[in-house]
Amino acid sequence: EPTMYGEILSPNYPQAYPSEVEKSWDIEVPEGYGIHLYFTHLDIELSENCAYDSVQIISGDTEEGRLCGQRSSNNPHSPIVEEFQVPYNKLQVIFKSDFSNEERFTGFAAYYVATDINECTDFVDVPCSHFCNNFIGGYFCSCPPEYFLHDDMKNCGVNCSGDVFTALIGEIASPNYPKPYPENSRCEYQIRLEKGFQVVVTLRREDFDVEAADSAGNCLDSLVFVAGDRQFGPYCGHGFPGPLNIETKSNALDIIFQTDLTGQKKGWKLRYHGDPMPCPKEDTPNSVWEPAKAKYVFRDVVQITCLDGFEVVEGRVGATSFYSTCQSNGKWSNSKLKCQPVDCGIPESIENGKVEDPESTLFGSVIRYTCEEPYYYMENGGGGEYHCAGNGSWVNEVLGPELPKCVPVCGVPREPFEEKQRIIGGSDADIKNFPWQVFFDNPWAGGALINEYWVLTAAHVVEGNREPTMYVGSTSVQTSRLAKSKMLTPEHVFIHPGWKLLEVPEGRTNFDNDIALVRLKDPVKMGPTVSPICLPGTSSDYNLMDGDLGLISGWGRTEKRDRAVRLKAARLPVAPLRKCKEVKVEKPTADAEAYVFTPNMICAGGEKGMDSCKGDSGGAFAVQDPNDKTKFYAAGLVSWGPQCGTYGLYTRVKNYVDWIMKTMQENSTPRED
């Protein structure tokens, strides 16, 4: 318990103190007092450095004194032989004696009293930053005007904290700038801008003068900027050492100015402004930004448009562009959206053709359509090569997105006809020599396939049966063979409007316009035994000359039989029409003069008895194409004749090409358009 005074006596005082003694006294006076310790008697064995016996006075860790020997007062009016004044409120006194004393020593008598200390002057470290006021038992600190005493009750500082700056532009300076800033202060300034703006601080070198760093490089006074988890500084010295433009990337900035007790300089002045938060110019592959700018900031909106062949897929919907906004956090909205290659998907299949499974269906991929060669070819050109275009469609250079159309190759027999022996006077043939040959079973006749949906024949073949049964692809027309061949079902029969319908067809003498078309219900699949014949062109190249050779085929009457079971064929030259007129009609049903001969008829035959006959009607008179001699076209259709084995008359198909085309176009299916 602290006391204000006290007495300390050596053991047995005033008798001699014993040997081998160590005794200590802990003196404590109240807080805020010092101790005045004084000795009125001192008689202790003398030794060098008081090594044998001594009284030791210790203040904290410091030895205030060590006494031995004999002392007497120098002042006749005072009994004090030795005294100590310490500004602390604790003191330790230790008495030690060794094992022997040569004489009898009486020890010491000492007294202590609590004394007032002047904290304001008695210490090396001044307790107050500014004004120190001493009183008995303590002191208090006070401050100059405009300063306030900190919570530690010792330090004065200016009231420079708590300012919050929210304006988009402003200026902040150290207290008293440009006069010296206050010592021992911590000034905190807060800049708080609207989200989406970053604080940008600008300083001039000459506007900064803060006490320089110590030898270790530590700032004694410092200016620090803190933006979120980023810190700029500490800065100190003469002239601003940091970047003159600090982009904080944050809308909140704390400015902390810390000063110590010494070395005041003029301080600092800065300007700040709110920059809209920049968003990075991101490298978004396969796209362009509109508008294109060197820098994008908060609230900027860009349209990101995918390059041709790329699209942004959100859910199941594909778009070619999207909008992105520079947000308050410096990040772009919709940043997850990306321009991906357009996917054209699995290409559509086509009739009578194929497309290889593509390795890829993405933008730029290439596919190739092919037709089922050699029976089909690509009608609408373009080569069949399509690439996956930017709009997600498979596109061809010529056709665009339109699919290729595989149409039958016409006029090309798989096996060319060769006369093996000497129809009338003809040779056995194979259906592969005449794959266009169509068999009509009622009446027994022929026709020519001209495309997938149409059969060309003579009008007199179908005038009595508008629903004929037809077969293709068979050399033999035996019932058992026909069962295995392809039967064609008619949808409609179109007889040429110029064909005169008679009540008694058997008595006919006028075969002008002996031509008809049969529209089929279903398309015919082409192959080696079924393939159409070409139609003639309308140019003069397709005008026949006398002597031009043509091929006829059919299952009609031969020299030996009324009807052939196996296909027969013959090669006939074109003859002048007069040659047909000159032949006497075999079984006339009327006067010879009644028979009509017109420019719509071709006369052919007269060579080695080769001719068409009853049952061959409607079959094609096939002539080599004048320009593409690997093909045959239907120059004529077996129509009538004066006498089998001589000359025959054939409908001149060239004169009906317009009617044929018009009829087919007007009665086509959408698939054929």
Epitope: P374, P416, D546, K629, T630
Partner: antibody, heavy 112, light 110 residues
Framework: SLEESGGRLVTPGTPLTLTCTVS????????MIWVRQAPGKGLEWIGV?????ITYYASWAKGRFTISKTSTTVDLQITSPTTEDTATYFC??????????WGPGTLVTVSS | AYDMTQTPASVEVAVGGTVTIKCQAS??????LAWYQQKPGQRPKLLIY???NLASGVPSRFKGSGSGTQFTLTISGVECADAATYYC????????????FGGGTKVEIK
């Protein structure tokens, strides 16, 4: 017009392709023939390609030559030339007015 | 097979004279026959098509005739410019053919 190219000196057995480049008409509508003429000899027909791409060859030329076409060219490949194949090779358009259009020819020399 | 035999192999004729060249087909080819003229180092030139039709720009002294298997080219009033080799060509089929051309007839002017 027609123009042959590709003729050169080759060693026996080295395949060689001659090309006939056409302009002014469509190959899809015409028959094109290849004809050759050995030095001091007559015209010898090799083969033909039709508008649809069908080909026919002279009986002696089958297997020795291959004819193919694109939209603007007709090719003749001599699969394994021998010294007897040394000749000027012509391509011609063969129409209803016969060989109405011929190229100038290209010389092929086969020598070891 | 369709083969063409041309005769004679060569012929000499005086200026102003007449030359007759014959061509025979092994099978009937109707009128599908053409005649060509070829001068050394040049491409063949079409003279006659469809057996008897004169090609464009060909002088009327050239005349073709025949049908079926027998055909003839006649050059009347021969001129020096007519010195050349003449070929016939069957224009009917490409199937089963060794050569569509005849062997050629060389016409020399005296």
């Amino acid at each position: 017009s027609l123009e042959e190219s590709g003729g050169r000196l080759v060693t026996p057995g080295t395949p060689l392709t001659l090309t006939c480049t056409v302009s002014g008409f469509s190959l899809s509508s015409y028959t094109m023939i290849w004809v050759r003429q050995a030095p001091g000899k007559g015209l010898e027909w090799i083969g033909v390609v039709g508008g649809s791409g069908i080909t026919y060859y002279a009986s002696w030329a089958k297997g020795r030559f291959t004819i193919s076409k694109t939209s603007t060219t007709v090719d003749l490949q001599i699969t394994s030339p021998t010294t007897e194949d040394t000749a000027t090779y012509f391509c011609a358009r063969d129409t209803s007015v016969a060989g109405d259009l011929w190229g100038p020819g290209t010389l092929v020399t086969v020598s070891s | 097979a369709y083969d063409m035999t041309q005769t004679p192999a060569s012929v000499e004729v005086a200026v102003g004279g007449t030359v007759t060249i014959k061509c025979q087909a092994s099978q009937s080819i109707g009128v599908s026959l053409a005649w060509y003229q070829q001068k050394p180092g040049q491409r063949p030139k079409l003279l006659i098509y469809k057996a008897s039709n004169l090609a464009s720009g060909v002088p009327s002294r050239f005349k073709g005739s025949g049908s079926g298997t027998q055909f003839t080219l006649t050059i009347s009033g021969v001129e020096c410019a007519d010195a050349a080799t003449y070929y016939c060509q069957q224009d009917y089929t490409y199937s089963d053919v060794t050569n569509i051309f005849g062997g050629g007839t060389k016409v020399e002017i005296k």
